[in-house]
Interface confidence: medium
């Protein structure tokens, strides 16, 4: 089943989904929040690691098809390497081909998530809302 | 707990969502699934019937704070009343003052949900995507 | 850029001891600091980390059950571990370390010097 | 918590030789995996991150490979500076583990 259902099916089952902190999104026994105060990209990492979470990892477009859906621009976890100019996740994982698409909005070292599966490059000092994600084991 | 929570907190409990349809989104005990196929407001209301669910629903801004996240136009269980110029939800409640900004795009009877709690209101035959919701008990 | 450590010291059991670590040579505000120990001929035991700027945000190790607290002063560019209710097998070498970039969080290139803590009565 | 299993504990080399050391998590963390070394009274020094990528100023003898669970530092020909203590460590995420360390002791 995607997000984007392209034919009515009946679900066979309900589930549970999670567990996640209370209040939170859950799609795919992954768990999102979204938060509206703005904050430079570091205070965000610390906002979302500070609830046992990081910043958003785009890891699977099938996974994480809710996030076609999302409007305005919110942090990544996603950095910019410049020893080797790779773009990376939080946790040091390369960020896979053909997931994001890069756009060079600013220049910086942190990037925006934006809906469709796009990364805004941006300053990583300027204020933005944020998403935080956990993904349950 | 806001979607948008305006402070760090430190989650006290991890909690389950649901139950819901596999793969659908959980959020406040609320199940959601957003789907890409356009239908007029009458198959969408069929689909998300099919599926023991809705038409989406909106009751509360705090309950559906995610709401305020959703791009584009996606058909809604809202429809307009001829005979006493209301606007009623499939299961027959009215509207609440101040849920929705209703904005007339289209002479219509039928409404599409829009982000920020907006009710744009359309010709109920056209074709759109949709939102379905079941409220967990 | 370098992290300079101080306290220590000889403590009894049950005793208490804060370690600080004073930054220089970049913005303190960005980074994580983290606190490593290492026992005598033993390995590396992350304890936990806090977030320089305003949030002040930790993060501590499970086995740290409350006995550790981590603060930090950002007009000092300093971070500090409190070590509480100490016993022999606290005995350690106790290093901060700073991530590789601001955005990194778990990847230390800059390191302390080391700080020995020893608990004995 | 990831577990982190480093082999062998210990190893006797000659200057010029190759060497490899393990580490093995105990579930995926993707190539989020460094490597330090140590050298006595000392404290870590950053080799490796990203699983492979080498840390500026560091010789290029050094190597890292493996993604997943499996991971792998090489010395392509070992240097008298080289005998040390080597220690993965994840940063997939918190908390984090250090593997028990590989000691690189002169034949």
């Known amino acids: 089943n995607s997000l984007f259902n392209q034919e009515v099916q009946i679900p066979l089952t309900e589930s549970y989904c999670g567990p996640c902190p209370k209040n939170w999104i859950c799609y795919k026994n992954n768990c999102y929040q979204f938060f509206n105060e703005s904050k430079n990209w570091y205070e965000s990492q610390a906002s979302c690691m500070s609830q046992n979470a990081s910043l958003l990892k785009v890891y699977s477009k099938e996974d994480q098809d809710l996030l076609k859906l999302v409007k305005s621009y919110h942090w990544m976890g996603l950095v910019h390497i410049p020893t080797n100019g790779s773009w990376q996740w939080e946790d040091g994982s390369i960020l896979s081909p053909n997931l994001l698409t890069i756009i060079e909005m600013q220049k910086g070292d942190c990037a925006l998530y934006a809906s469709s599966f796009k990364g805004y490059i941006e300053n990583c000092s300027i204020p933005n809302t944020y998403i935080c994600m956990q993904r349950t084991v | 707990n806001s979607l948008f929570n305006q402070e760090v907190q430190i989650p006290l409990t991890e909690s389950y969502c649901g139950p819901c349809p596999k793969n659908w989104i959980c959020y406040k005990n609320n199940c959601y699934q957003f789907f890409n196929e356009s239908k007029n407001w009458y198959e969408s209301q069929a689909s998300c019937m099919s599926q023991n669910a809705s038409l989406l629903k909106v009751y509360s801004k705090e309950d559906q704070d995610l709401l305020k996240l959703v791009k584009s136009y996606h058909w809604m269980g809202l429809v307009h009343i001829p005979t006493n110029g209301s606007w009623q939800w499939e299961d027959g409640s009215i509207l609440s003052p101040n849920l929705l900004t209703i904005i007339e795009m289209q002479k219509g009877d039928c409404a599409l949900y829009a982000s920020s709690f907006k009710g744009y209101i359309e010709n109920c035959s056209i074709p759109n995507t949709y939102i379905c919701m079941q409220r967990t008990v | 850029q370098q992290l300079e450590q101080s306290g220590g010291g000889l403590v009894t059991p049950g005793g208490s001891l804060k370690v600080c670590c004073k930054a220089?040579?970049?913005?303190?505000?960005?980074?994580?600091m983290t606190w490593v120990r290492q026992a005598p001929e033993k390995g590396l035991e992350w304890i936990g980390c806090i977030h320089g700027g305003d949030s002040g945000a930790t993060y501590y190790a499970n086995w740290v059950n409350g006995r550790f607290t981590l603060s930090r002063d950002i007009d000092q560019s300093t971070g500090c571990l409190q070590l509480n209710s100490l016993t022999a097998a606290d005995t350690a070498m106790y290093y901060c370390?700073?991530?590789?970039?601001?955005?990194?969080?778990?990847?230390?290139?800059?390191w302390g010097q080391g700080t020995m803590v020893t608990v004995s009565s | 918590d990831i577990q982190m299993t480093q082999s062998p504990s210990s190893l006797s080399a000659s200057v010029g030789d190759r060497v490899t050391i393990t580490c093995q998590a105990s579930q995926d963390i993707s190539n989020a995996l460094n490597w330090y070394q140590q050298k006595p009274g000392k404290a870590p020094k950053l080799l490796i991150y990203?699983?492979?990528t080498l840390q500026s100023g560091v010789p290029s003898r050094f190597s890292g490979s493996g993604s997943g669970t499996d991971f792998t530092l090489t010395i392509s020909s070992l240097q008298p500076e080289d005998f040390a203590t080597y220690y993965c460590q994840h940063s997939n995420s918190f908390p984090l583990t250090f593997g028990g360390g590989t000691k690189v002791e002169i034949k």
């Open positions: 220089s040579g970049f913005d303190f505000t960005t980074y994580w």
């Open positions: 370390a700073r991530p590789g970039y601001p955005s990194w969080s778990k990847t230390f290139d800059l």
């Open positions: 990203a699983a492979s």
